[in-house]
């Protein structure tokens, strides 16, 4: 078992004549995610066939506006990696199809009007465990940059993430017909627990290394589909002439799910309700203790020292499921205020302020003079979703509330003194200059610098600067 | 601009057959994360959904109906079939079909785009 | 199954009222959606995935909740909001909906 990561890095116009026009406009605002399909082998990159290595999908990214006129630049993306886990055996050869697609935000008639704006696929070869791959694929005018990689979960290790490694039972070997983990080799390998490829909705196992199928399905790897030979039905011959109108066997059929599982079907899979004591796609995990990591993204796993006595999981926030394995829609709770858009990061939840709020849940307001007061004769200036006090002289600070020392910076020139003034500031200026802040020499000859001192005011004065 | 259209016969008789067609336009079959449902609705009563097919031919049918159900698509032709055999006047109802939309790969995002329903009487 | 229990049955209101409905499923669900009928025309969709407002929805629809328990809110009703409402879940087959809310004009 592994996951595989996709990083975007850009999403905008390729080089070269015919610049795309923008997804988005002023009074069609929208916003960018993108989804990602996996396949194993070099297969076709036809987008109907199933993402039999999984599917990903990303957050929504930044609302974005196009200004008029203005050519299609890199557009806002989504935070944070696509992630696909897959649980099998990397395959080493993939193809994938990586879509973008933009989310309108205008008032639209019916539901969220989503539309496809590029499609990008390909094949190729990656080790699970390898550095970022980086890629840039381009569909029409559009380009699209990115980088990926597939890392095994623990306890898989390998290429392939097939090779199982736990913590030795004994400090000296592994048990019989086990060989050290290399590189780790204070731990062992473990035996793979179905074969490498097996069809996880259409396959099973029950000893390690099998791959059994479920009604419907044959093959080593149980992904090919039993042909319907004829319409003997429980339903009778269909007179369609497209042939013969048997459904396909669901995913329920025949019960994949071991240990006395219950199983439902989803919108497109199924899902094991599992016993205590069993875990797995399947349930078919047993015999669990925490030595085994039972619990998911980080749960942490009480109890259960011996195979008999049950193990209890306590899950991080974000995580819930008796092993910590599902998710909680966090963001459905909506706890950003004030029209904020709520990211589920996964560790944490952020929330992306509208413009005039602030905080971690945008609960503070920054927004307006409306009822807020500068103090000491202080002007209240609105910008940018905020406002700001522009202060009389001698006063500063967010509210205008603090005096502030014209003197603190030292104004007065060439080591003249500075005194406060309910007006300013005055420097008194040391012997042979003179100026509103001493800046100018007065001449041996008595003659300044300057054309003429101000009327009352004689060179050497202290200067009050206005 | 999204559209869903049933179509099919008002009035069949007990133990036939229904076979109802949904045609739509301003999306297609062929692009992933689309689906197509069928839901129904008894006079008076809830609505009840049927069956739905996606687009890389994942099928999924009401339990207590299954025996009685087949729904095909022809990509080609923007079009979603749905078969009914054994028709009981239990089954009178308005018949819609709607826009399924799967981003994530069983999460269904919305059923966003309904047709204007079919009312079928079965009655001999 | 998974049962979809809606209450009230029935609700009588007035315009400017805040109005809240409920509908509890009888399994956890991961999200919750939510469709206003009005008779003789078919059902449109209001809220996806819990709490996001399908477009051309008015503001003062809003939905929460989560597990087995959740809510649609109508914060200041509408002369056009009198209809019946619908929740449903998309967990697991049947994905089966709620027996309906009828917002009535008091």
């Known amino acids: 078992a592994g996951v595989f990561e996709l990083q975007i890095h850009s999403f905008g116009p390729g080089p070269g004549p015919g610049a795309p026009r923008s997804p988005c406009s002023a009074r069609l605002p929208c916003r960018l995610f993108f989804r990602v399909c996996l396949k194993p082998g070099l297969s076709e990159e036809a987008a109907e066939s199933p993402c039999a290595l999984g599917a990903a999908l990303s957050a929504r990214g930044p609302v974005y506006t196009e200004q008029p006129g203005a050519p299609a630049p890199d557009l806002p993306l989504p935070d944070g990696l696509l992630q696909v886990p897959f649980r099998d055996a990397w395959p080493g050869t993939f193809s994938f199809i990586i879509e973008t697609w933009r989310e309108e935000l205008g008032d639209q008639i019916g539901g969220p009007a989503w539309s496809l704006l590029a499609r990008v696929a390909g094949r190729r070869r990656l080790a699970a465990g390898g550095p970022w791959a980086r890629d840039i694929q381009r569909a029409g005018a559009w380009e699209l940059r990115f980088s990926y990689r597939a890392r095994c979960e623990p306890p898989a290790v390998g290429t392939a993430c097939t090779r199982l490694c736990r913590p030795r039972s004994a400090p000296s070997r592994c048990g019989p017909g086990l060989r050290p983990c290399a590189p780790l080799e204070d731990e062992c390998e473990a035996p793979l627990v179905c074969r490498a490829g097996c069809s996880p909705e259409h396959g099973f196992c029950e000893q390690p290394g099998e791959c059994r199928c479920l009604e419907g399905w044959t093959g080593p790897l149980c992904t090919v589909p039993v042909s319907t030979s004829s319409c003997l039905s429980p339903r009778g011959p269909s007179s369609a002439t497209t042939g013969c109108l048997v459904p396909g066997p669901g995913p329920c059929d025949g019960n994949p799910c071991a240990n006395g599982g219950s199983c439902s079907e989803t919108p497109r899979s199924f899902e094991c309700t599992c016993p205590r004591g069993f875990y797995g796609l399947r349930c078919e995990v047993s015999g669990v203790t925490c030595a085994d990591g039972p619990c998911f993204n980080g749960g942490l796993c009480v109890g259960g020292a011996d195979p008999d006595s049950a193990y209890i999981c306590h899950c991080p926030p974000g995580f819930q499921g008796s092993n910590c394995e599902k998710r909680v829609d966090r963001c459905s709770l909506q706890p950003c205020r004030n029209g904020g858009l709520c990211l589920d990061l996964g560790h944490a939840l952020r929330c992306r302020c509208r413009a005039g709020f602030a905080g971690p849940r945008c609960e503070h307001d920054l927004d307006d003079c409306a009822g807020r007061a500068c103090a000491n004769g202080g002007t209240c200036v609105e910008g940018g979703g905020a406002h700001r006090c522009s202060c009389a002289l001698g006063f500063g600070g967010r509210d205008c509330r603090e005096r502030a020392d014209p003197c603190a910076a030292r104004p007065c020139a060439h080591g003249g003194r500075c005194y406060a003034h309910f007006s300013g500031l005055v420097c008194a200026c040391a012997p042979g200059y003179m100026g509103a802040r001493c800046e100018f020499p007065v001449h041996p000859d008595g003659a300044s610098a300057l054309p003429a001192a101000p009327p009352g005011l004689r060179p050497g004065d202290p200067q009050r600067y206005l | 601009q999204i559209t869903l259209k049933e179509s099919g016969p008002t009035l069949v008789k007990p133990t036939q057959t229904l076979t109802l067609t949904c045609t739509f336009s301003?999306?297609?079959?062929?692009?992933?994360?689309?689906?197509v449902g069928w839901i129904r609705q008894p006079p008076g009563k809830a609505l009840e959904w049927l069956a739905h097919?996606?687009?890389?031919?994942?099928?999924r049918y009401s339990p207590s109906l299954k025996s009685r159900l087949t729904i095909t698509k022809d990509t080609s032709k923007n079009q979603v079939v749905l078969t009914m055999t054994n028709m009981d006047p239990v089954d009178t109802a308005t018949y819609y079909c709607?826009?399924?939309?799967?981003?994530?790969?069983?999460?269904?995002?919305?059923?966003?785009?309904w047709g204007q329903g079919t009312l079928v009487t079965v009655s001999s | 199954d998974i049962q979809m229990t809606q209450s009230p049955s029935s609700l009588s209101a007035s315009v400017g009222d805040r109005v809240t409905i409920t509908c509890s499923a009888s399994?956890?669900?991961?999200?919750m959606y939510w469709y206003q009928q009005k008779p003789g025309k078919a059902p449109k969709l209001l809220i996806y995935l819990t709490s996001n407002l399908a477009s051309g929805v008015p503001s003062r629809f809003s939905g929460s909740g989560s597990g087995t328990d959740f809510t649609l809110t109508i914060s200041s009703l509408q002369p056009e909001d009198f209809a019946t409402y619908y929740c449903?879940?998309?967990?697991?087959?049947?994905?089966?909906f709620g027996q309906g809310t009828k917002l009535e004009i008091k």
């Open positions: 097919i996606w687009w890389d031919d994942v099928k």
């Open positions: 709607a826009r399924i939309v799967s981003f994530d790969n069983d999460v269904v995002s919305a059923m966003d785009y």
């Open positions: 301003g999306f297609s079959l062929s692009t992933s994360g689309m689906g």
């Open positions: 399994h956890s669900v991961s999200y």
């Open positions: 449903q879940q998309w967990r697991s087959n049947p994905f089966t």
